[in-house]
């Protein structure tokens, strides 16, 4: 057993070396090890075949180190590995696409708070058993096509707290078992109409705290199992182009957040769901050089990116403007309230179990600009729309073991409390 470690055989053969100031993966780890705990050290590099001798390894925790490099063959030979925790290694920044190849039994992979800027092609290839993938609180800007294609058993995908600006058509291809997709606190301004085509089992979709001004209902159509949807804290434009979303929300039988309007000015702060159909008239247009709010691409039907309902016809040249108002949106779409500028809001009156599950607090938190938050820190500012009644999966036996966020051997993503007790 390596000097800084404790090794024991019952109930599983374990090599445990947490928080020992180790600067490298120790030599002499017993080959029979089923669990290796190396978290909280100063390890900066995982060389090729570091654990090759450990053929029975099922759990490997390397979280909270200072990993800057993981050799592509670092985990070679670990065919039985089920849990791999690499989180809280902010200097990592990139992972060789071959790193996880051969980990056919892996069901939980933590890559949260690793400073990742991109997901290389084929990074998750062959991980057919993967159920939980933690990618939150990184610096990801894009979701390349088919990144998750092989993850047919993935149930939880955590992508919140990144810098993702759009959800392309093939981003989530192959995720037929996905139950929870968390995309909140990003910079998403555009969702492709077919982005969620394979997500027929999705129950929870979080898109709050993004940059969405519109959302094609075609994107929501495949989500037959959807029960929990959060869309708050986005710059929604509640004019004629919001009618399809408004109609979809009226029919939606699950729980959904408020969808507060940013434009037009007369509807600012109002919840789209509570508007009447005839409130959604005309088109709100930003001032200055013509810059349509609509995020779709220009087509024959939508010249300059304007949807059909916003195109002026010969009979009514003013129909592109909000009725009775100048073509000015003020600064409604420019800047979000900086974190902490608004005090946390409170509901009023006693709370009951059957209260509406979502409420909107004033202010709005900018998606994190830093790649990671240190362990133990709160997110920037207050959460902008915290549901009191947060969605959960239906379960009768009240256990975390089959449906909790972050189950199946994972520690879940996110941070600890920073407040003292």
């Amino acid at each position: 057993c390596p000097g800084a470690c404790v090794c024991y055989n019952e109930p599983k053969v374990t090599t445990s070396c947490p928080q020992q100031g180790l600067q490298a993966v120790p030599v002499g780890i017993p080959a029979a090890s089923q669990r290796i705990f190396l978290h909280g050290n100063r390890i900066s590099h995982v060389p090729a075949a570091s654990f090759r001798a450990c053929r029975n390894l099922t759990i490997l925790w390397l979280h909270s180190n200072v990993l800057a490099r993981i050799d592509a063959a670092a985990f070679t030979g670990l065919a039985l590995l089920e849990q791999l925790d690499l989180s809280d290694n902010a200097q990592l920044r990139s992972v060789d696409p071959a790193t996880f190849h051969g980990l056919g039994r892996l069901h939980t992979l933590h890559l949260d708070r690793c400073g990742l800027q991109e997901l290389g092609p084929g990074l998750f290839r062959g991980l057919a058993a993967l159920q939980y993938l933690y990618l939150q609180d990184n610096a990801l800007q894009a979701l390349p096509d088919d990144t998750f294609r092989d993850l047919g058993n993935l149930t939880h995908l955590f992508l919140h707290g990144n810098r993702i600006s759009s959800v392309p058509e093939r981003a989530f291809r192959g995720l037929h078992s996905l139950d929870r997709l968390l995309l909140h606190q990003n910079r998403v301004a555009h969702v492709h109409p077919h982005a969620f085509r394979d997500l027929g089992r999705l129950m929870t979709l979080y898109l709050f705290a993004n940059n969405l001004s519109a959302l094609p209902t075609e994107a929501l159509a495949p989500l037959r199992a959807l029960q929990y949807l959060r869309l708050n804290d986005n710059p929604w434009v509640c004019d004629c182009r919001a009618r399809p979303l408004w109609a979809w929300l009226q029919k939606f039988r699950g729980s959904s957040s408020e969808v507060p309007c940013s434009l037009p000015q007369r509807l600012a702060g109002r919840d789209l769901k509570r508007l009447a159909a005839n409130d959604l008239q005309g088109c709100a247009v930003a001032t200055g050089p013509y810059h349509p709010i609509w995020t779709g691409r220009a087509t024959d039907e939508e010249p300059l990116g304007l949807p059909k309902c916003c195109q002026p016809d010969a009979a009514d040249k003013a129909s592109v403007l909000e009725p009775g108002r100048p073509a000015s949106a003020g600064n409604a779409l420019k800047g979000r309230v900086p974190p902490g500028d608004s005090p946390p809001g409170n509901g009023s009156g006693p709370r009951h179990i059957n209260d509406s599950p979502f409420g909107t607090l004033p202010g709005s938190a900018e998606p994190p600009l830093t790649a990671v938050r240190p362990e133990g820190s709160e997110p920037p500012g207050f959460p902008t729309s915290g549901p009191r009644r947060r969605p959960g999966c239906s379960r009768k036996n009240r256990t975390r073991s089959h449906c909790r966020l972050g189950q199946a051997g994972s520690g879940g993503g996110g941070t600890g409390d920073s407040e003292g007790s």
């Epitope: 955590f158 409170n346 009240r398």
Partner: antibody, heavy 125, light 107 residues
Framework: QMQLVQSGAEVKKPGASVKVSCKVS????????IHWVRQAPGKGLEWMGG????????VYAQKFQGRVTLTDDTSTDTAYMELSSLRSEDTAVYYC??????????????????WGRGTMITVSS | DIQMTQSPSSVSASVGDRVTITCRAS??????LAWYQQKPGKAPKLLIY???RLQSGVPLRFSGSGSGTDFTLTINSLQPEDSATYYC?????????FGQGTRLEIK
């Protein structure tokens, strides 16, 4: 900095009820899961109940079912624990505690990260 | 309910020693375990959650590991202020249950 400030010590007669308050400062109560834990003199910690953010409901330990009621008032950011039909064995320090996990930050861990200082309830005839 | 069993129930060690406290769950709780420290007359203080995550502000001499049914809290280089009672708690399901506690005394 977030704090949980509990109401003061009380002495109660057997059969009576007691209502302990837990005022949250520095964070909106609507964002939190508050749990209640008690500790009899010289004994260990005993979970009584709290808000389960996954199943969207308040849950109670079976031992206290029917005797304890947990409520919140978001207008004052105060959580309450009421225990009825008091008996001498209910003499204990009662703590409120904030669960670490809250979904908006992407934190899925469950553990009691912040505790109130405790409220001593003495049940004596 | 899940039973949590700590051992030893009390331990006495000297400053600078390494102390290990173990906690066993009556069924698999994955890594859903927290450790608390409580000093006389004070509220408990969270040390570790999710079996191995160190709570903010907790000294690095505290570490946790384990998964499934067996877990350990290790205190390296024991300090006088570590004299306290330590509790484990499973956070895998309801009802939340605590171990009976381990009293750590500094010789």
């Amino acid at each position: 900095q977030m704090q949980l400030v509990q109401s003061g010590a009380e002495v109660k007669k057997p059969g009576a009820s007691v209502k302990v308050s837990c005022k949250v400062s520095g964070y909106p109560l609507s964002e939190l899961s508050i749990h209640w834990v008690r500790q009899a003199p010289g004994k260990g910690l005993e979970w009584m109940g709290g808000f389960d953010s996954e199943d969207d409901e308040t849950v109670y330990a079976q031992k206290f079912q029917g005797r304890v009621t947990l409520t919140d008032d978001t207008s004052t950011d105060t959580a309450y624990m009421e225990l009825s039909s008091l008996r001498s064995e209910d003499t204990a320090v009662y703590y409120c505690a904030r669960d670490l996990g809250y979904l908006t930050s992407g934190n899925y861990y469950d553990a009691f990260g912040i505790w109130g200082r405790g409220t001593m309830i003495t049940v004596s005839s | 309910d899940i039973q949590m069993t700590q051992s030893p129930s009390s331990v006495s060690a000297s400053v600078g020693d390494r102390v290990t406290i173990t906690c066993r769950a009556s069924q698999d709780i994955n890594r859903w375990l927290a450790w608390y420290q409580q000093k006389p007359g004070k509220a408990p203080k969270l040390l570790i959650y999710a079996a191995s995550r160190l709570q903010s502000g907790v000294p690095l001499r505290f570490s946790g590991s384990g998964s499934g049914t067996d877990f350990t809290l290790t205190i390296n280089s024991l300090q006088p202020e570590d004299s306290a009672t330590y509790y484990c708690q499973q956070t895998n399901n309801f009802p939340r249950t605590f171990g009976q506690g381990t009293r750590l005394e500094i010789k």
